[in-house]
Interface confidence: low
């Protein structure tokens, strides 16, 4: 490490004194120092002299000896003060630049130790500093601002009390660059439009950034549009608005127009799609089969998209039949929009009856006309089953009448014994019926279907059943002959209520 | 935080000097970093500011008090004082002491309750 | 000197109404502007810096905006502890004025 002689850390002199640094080291020294007048450097192998013979307070500041083949970068220093009753501030420069958060150094060196006790910082013109300002001072630096904020890009002056009178720094101006996160934020609205030939309209792109060196433009089909740009200041960052204004809009407007924004840390673009249209428009539609079928006792949501332009002037649900003269509930009733062009509108239908069955029509309105869509909605049933015992042409027939929805299919069992259900083990012939006759079939509406099993002769110990099932469910009717007659029942669990 | 508090007559009379003298305590008033203020408010009026001292010992006076006025510290005491010369009626008010860190810029972080001085003869 | 213009001088308002007072500077003093209440009797108590900043302590309903020559004070919900006289004071230059205050009475 090199010596410097003298080897006191500060040397205090007066202005015209002659001073000399001498610098020793193993090898070559260098001398590094603030810049000012009148210094003579002297080297000497090893050794290397700063000297001057008109100290002044320029002079005032901490010289640093280096040895630079030392590989451990060793080092000495001294500060030097030059106490000039007229000078008790050597400002070494008169403009700081730092970046947000990080510490400013405002480098005024007080050029008398014994003043650092009347020190302070100030804004020119007396002001006084803002609130909150964290600073401290160093007679060798400084004042040093901590964690500057671009609020704070000011002027200062360092301020000492010299008999009784305040005597101040010339000025410091610290300018505080705001750390740029990245390209502009940009903001195009609105973010899809659609006008009428002749309508006028309006697309606006702006930008904005915590500094306010950036540039933004918007663009028609990669055309640059002349467009005057409107500047502010607003919650610490600066925006820059461009606004096309457009009193009657043609073909040639239509279009992709693009936001592009750029500063030092890149660009950032979004874009929107302008569509003129010849006339109003008003499309229905919807992602679901516009033919639903539900089981009975269960929910539905009824879906239709709107695309429209003009907004829409009014729309409703309505049901058209065939049961009732109900209408849908409003509360039930839903509308979502989407983007500005685009609704979806839902019509909830909770826990199904059957006299909901029916066609549900969505109609809306615009100044492109009415326009419906409607769904038509069928209720899916388990079949309910009877069977009773008649004669038909002479013969003795049993006859199963069966309603559900989809069409119930028939099975005939005969099983031994007394039974409500026959089992596997009890049958002992089945019969299917694979095309009953249909007695009624209307839309919305059960189908009933009708079978018939012609019995000789019905055996009094055994069970006849008839069977029916859909998709949905199934159900059975036992007959039991017995002495006195026939004797019919459905079996206990059968008891459907929707 | 400081705490202070103003002391001194209550009535003075035309053309005399009001003296008032504010006593700090939970701080210095030679410790660095504080302005020392003087305010004023005349009865059901605003507030004016009448100037300050800076740890220091530099003033800084309202331009429009400024002929008049004098801010001066005791640091044997820890009080700094006030003295407004050749009053008149028209400076009948309720006068606050405050304390500001000065590396706010604020002045008046802290605050006296005030006493009332009434110019009269 | 700044001249700091208070409106309105004074004002009427219930428990949980929102009270805006507005103070205009006769120039820019870009955001050096502070928010006191004061209490009858009472030395002012400082509640907002630096024209936006909440001073520690301060309820959050106490809020204030502004830059340049045009600022306001907010208390988004009065309670009938705030019935008091708020005044706005610039720190740009000196000397540091005040504006002329805000009496908030109670409806």
């Known amino acids: 490490i090199p010596v410097i002689e003298p080897s006191v850390p500060e040397l205090v002199v007066k202005p015209g004194a002659t001073v000399t640094l001498r610098c020793v080291g193993n090898g070559s020294v260098e001398w590094d120092g603030p810049p000012s007048p009148h210094w003579t450097l002297y080297s000497d192998g090893s050794s290397s002299i700063l000297s001057t013979n008109n100290a002044t307070f320029q002079n005032t500041g901490t010289y640093r000896c280096t040895e630079p083949g030392d590989p451990l970068g060793g080092s000495a220093a001294i500060h030097l003060y030059v106490k000039d009753p007229a000078r008790p501030w050597n400002v070494l420069a008169q403009e700081v630049v730092v970046f947000e958060d990080q510490d400013a150094l405002l480098p005024c060196l007080l050029t008398d130790p014994v003043l650092e006790a009347g020190v302070s910082l100030v804004r020119v013109r007396g002001r006084p500093l803002m609130r909150h300002t964290n600073y401290s001072f160093s007679p060798w630096h400084g004042f040093t601002i901590h964690r500057a904020k671009f609020i704070q890009s000011q002027d200062y002056q360092c301020s000492a009390l010299m008999g009784g009178r305040k005597v101040m720094s010339i000025s410091i101006r610290l300018k505080v660059q705001k750390v740029i996160p990245g390209p502009p934020a940009l903001t195009l609205v609105p973010a899809e439009l659609v006008r009428i030939r002749g309508e006028a309209a309006q697309i606006v792109c702006s930008a904005s950034s915590v500094d306010v060196n950036f540039d933004v433009f918007l663009q028609h089909n990669n055309t640059k549009l002349a467009i005057p740009q409107q500047s502010d200041f607003h919650n610490n960052r600066y925006q820059k608005v461009l606004t096309l204004n457009l009193d009657q809009v043609d073909f040639q407007h239509a279009g992709n127009y693009s936001c592009v924004a750029s500063n030092v840390q890149g660009k950032h673009s979004t874009s929107m799609f302008f569509r003129v249209v010849e006339s109003a428009y008003l499309n229905l539609s919807s992602e679901q089969n516009l033919i639903q079928e539900v089981t009975v006792g269960e929910g539905l949501n009824l879906k239709v998209m709107v695309e429209a332009y003009p907004g829409l002037q009014g729309f409703n649900w309505t049901y058209l039949g065939p049961f009732s003269d109900h209408q849908p509930e409003p509360k039930l009733a839903n509308a979502t929009t989407k983007d500005t062009y685009r609704h979806t509108f839902t019509l909830s239908l909770p826990r199904l009856k059957p006299s909901e069955a029916g066609r549900y029509s969505f109609l809306a309105r615009n100044p492109g006309g009415w326009r419906a869509l409607t769904f038509e909605l069928t209720l899916r049933y388990p079949p309910e089953v009877s069977v009773i015992w008649t004669f038909i042409n002479g013969s003795g027939t049993l006859l199963c009448a069966a309603s559900g929805y989809p069409q119930p299919n028939v099975t005939w069992l005969q099983c031994s014994g007394h039974t409500d259900r026959c089992d596997e083990a009890q049958v002992l012939q089945v019969w299917d019926d694979p095309y009953p006759e249909v007695l009624s079939q209307e839309p919305f509406h059960k189908v009933t279907v009708q079978s018939l099993l012609t019995v000789e002769t019905l055996e009094h110990n055994q069970t006849y059943e008839c069977r029916a099932h859909n998709s949905v469910g199934s159900g059975s009717w036992a007959f039991i002959p017995i002495s006195a007659g026939a004797h019919t029942h459905p079996p206990d669990e059968f008891l459907f209520t929707p | 935080q400081v705490q202070l508090q103003e002391s001194g007559p209550g009535l003075v009379k035309p053309s005399e000097t009001l003296s008032l003298t504010c006593t700090v305590s939970?701080?210095?008033?030679?410790?660095?970093?504080?302005?020392w203020s003087w305010i004023r408010q005349p009865p059901g009026k605003g507030l004016e500011w009448i100037g300050y001292?800076?740890?220091?010992?530099?003033?800084n006076y309202n331009p429009s008090l400024k002929s008049r006025v004098t801010i001066s510290v005791d640091t044997s005491k820890n009080q700094f004082s006030l003295k407004l010369s050749s009053v008149t009626a028209a400076d009948t008010a309720v006068y606050y002491c405050?304390?500001?860190?000065?590396?706010?810029?604020?002045?008046?972080?802290?605050w006296g309750q005030g006493t009332l001085v009434t110019v009269s003869s | 000197d700044i001249q700091m213009t208070q409106s309105p001088s004074s004002l009427s308002a219930s428990v949980g109404d929102r009270v805006t007072i507005t103070c205009q500077a006769s120039?820019?003093?870009?955001?050096?502007l502070n928010w006191y209440q004061q209490k009858p009797g009472k030395a002012p108590k400082l509640l907002i810096y630096?024209?936006?900043n909440l001073e520690t302590g301060v309820p959050s309903r106490f809020s204030g905006s502004g830059s340049g020559t045009d600022f306001t004070f907010i208390i988004s919900s009065l309670q009938p502890e705030d019935i008091a006289t708020y005044y706005c004071?610039?720190?740009?230059?000196?000397?540091?004025?005040f504006g002329g205050g805000t009496k908030v009475e109670s409806k």
């Open positions: 120039q820019d003093i870009s955001n050096y």
């Open positions: 939970g701080g210095s008033v030679s410790s660095g970093g504080y302005y």
């Open positions: 405050a304390a500001g860190i000065a590396a706010t810029g604020t002045l008046f972080d802290c």
């Open positions: 004071q610039q720190f740009d230059n000196l000397p540091p004025t």
């Open positions: 001292i800076y740890y220091s010992g530099s003033t």
């Open positions: 630096d024209a936006s």
